[in-house]
Amino acid sequence: DAGVIQSPRHEVTEMGQEVTLRCKPISGHNSLFWYRQTMMRGLELLIYFNNNVPIDDSGMPEDRFSAKMPNASFSTLKIQPSEPRDSAVYFCASSL
């Protein structure tokens, strides 16, 4: 199993631009999680899906952030417009 696959591995953008992060969960997993990690704020859960349905998006109250899971094998996290403070490592995770 290839595990969870994210793209891109690295992203550099200008402030104000749209950024889209993509995730392919492990096949058969029905829960998907997006996290953000920074030195200042640590690891934050942004949103999680169960059976493609968003369950809790309270980690991303700014409407610059939006996440979709159109099917069981794909999810996106979009930031529009992006800000310098969005610089972070974004993790996607999946579970049974």
Epitope: E44, L45, I55, D56, S58, G59, P61, D63
Partner: antibody, heavy 117, light 106 residues
Framework: EVQLVESGGGLVQPGGSLRLSCAAS????????MHWVRQAPGKGLEWVSY????????YYADTLKGRFTISRDNSKNTLYLQMNSLRAEDTAVYYC??????????WGQGTTVTVSS | DNQLTQSPSFLSASVGDRVTITCRAS?????IYWYQQKPGKAPKLLIY???NLAPGVPSRFSGSGSGNEYTLTISSLQPEDFATYYC?????????FGQGTKLEIK
């Protein structure tokens, strides 16, 4: 029926502290982000702070950072706002509100904080 | 911080009138949210994501706009609509409010 009930307001001297509480019922509290908003007498609404469902994501109004601390206890269905080094300009009605529809979909009735010597 | 400016700040109108309140943002926002507040009461969510009516809100209320300029329209004022209206943005923290528009009976 969603209900939010604030408490803990009162009269406090400048430099003093208060802890506000917001008791939630009628919904699964642990699934929702929560806000504090305040309104000074005769003035408009001012956003104070936000906390996510699991307390991992917290935001404050820039002017209040360092003096106010938001927290929650999901086992007690309660939201808190610890307010330290209070000033006269902190006098206001403080509301808690649930995050819903991307906004604040339910509000409490408010609790009044008066900072005066 | 993104400053929201509502106009007008005060508005006198009559029952049956069509009323429009504008909310301008100092920086572009994705959506605007509108609240109604009556004296001594907590605010009530009217419109979310710019144009969606909150549950129980009458269809005479509508919202529109994009970028830096948004509007709240009441198509035919009813006696219970006289109140103060606030816009708010959630595009970027801090989640600022407009200064409010007080709608009074003419």
């Amino acid at each position: 029926e969603v209900q939010l009930v604030e408490s803990g307001g009162g009269l406090v001297q400048p430099g003093g502290s208060l802890r506000l509480s917001c008791a939630a019922s009628g919904f699964t509290f642990s699934n929702f982000g929560m806000h504090w908003v305040r309104q000074a007498p005769g003035k408009g609404l001012e956003w104070v702070s936000y906390i996510s469902s699991g307390s991992r994501t917290i935001y404050y109004a820039d002017t209040l950072k360092g003096r106010f601390t938001i927290s929650r206890d999901n086992s007690k269905n309660t939201l808190y706002l610890q307010m330290n080094s209070l000033r006269a300009e902190d006098t206001a009605v403080y509301y808690c509100a649930r995050r819903g529809e991307g906004a604040m979909d339910y509000w409490g009735q408010g609790t009044t904080v008066t900072v005066s010597s | 911080d993104n400053q929201l400016t509502q106009s007008p700040s005060f508005l006198s109108a009559s029952v049956g009138d069509r009323v429009t309140i504008t909310c301008r943002a100092s920086s572009s926002v994705n959506y605007i949210y509108w609240y109604q507040q009556k004296p001594g009461k907590a605010p009530k969510l009217l419109i979310y994501y710019t144009s969606n009516l909150a549950p129980g809100v009458p269809s005479r209320f509508s919202g529109s706009g994009s970028g830096n300029e948004y509007t709240l329209t009441i198509s035919s004022l009813q006696p219970e609509d006289f109140a103060t209206y606030y816009c708010q943005q959630f595009t970027s923290s801090p989640f600022t409010f407009g200064q409010g528009t007080k709608l009074e009976i003419k």
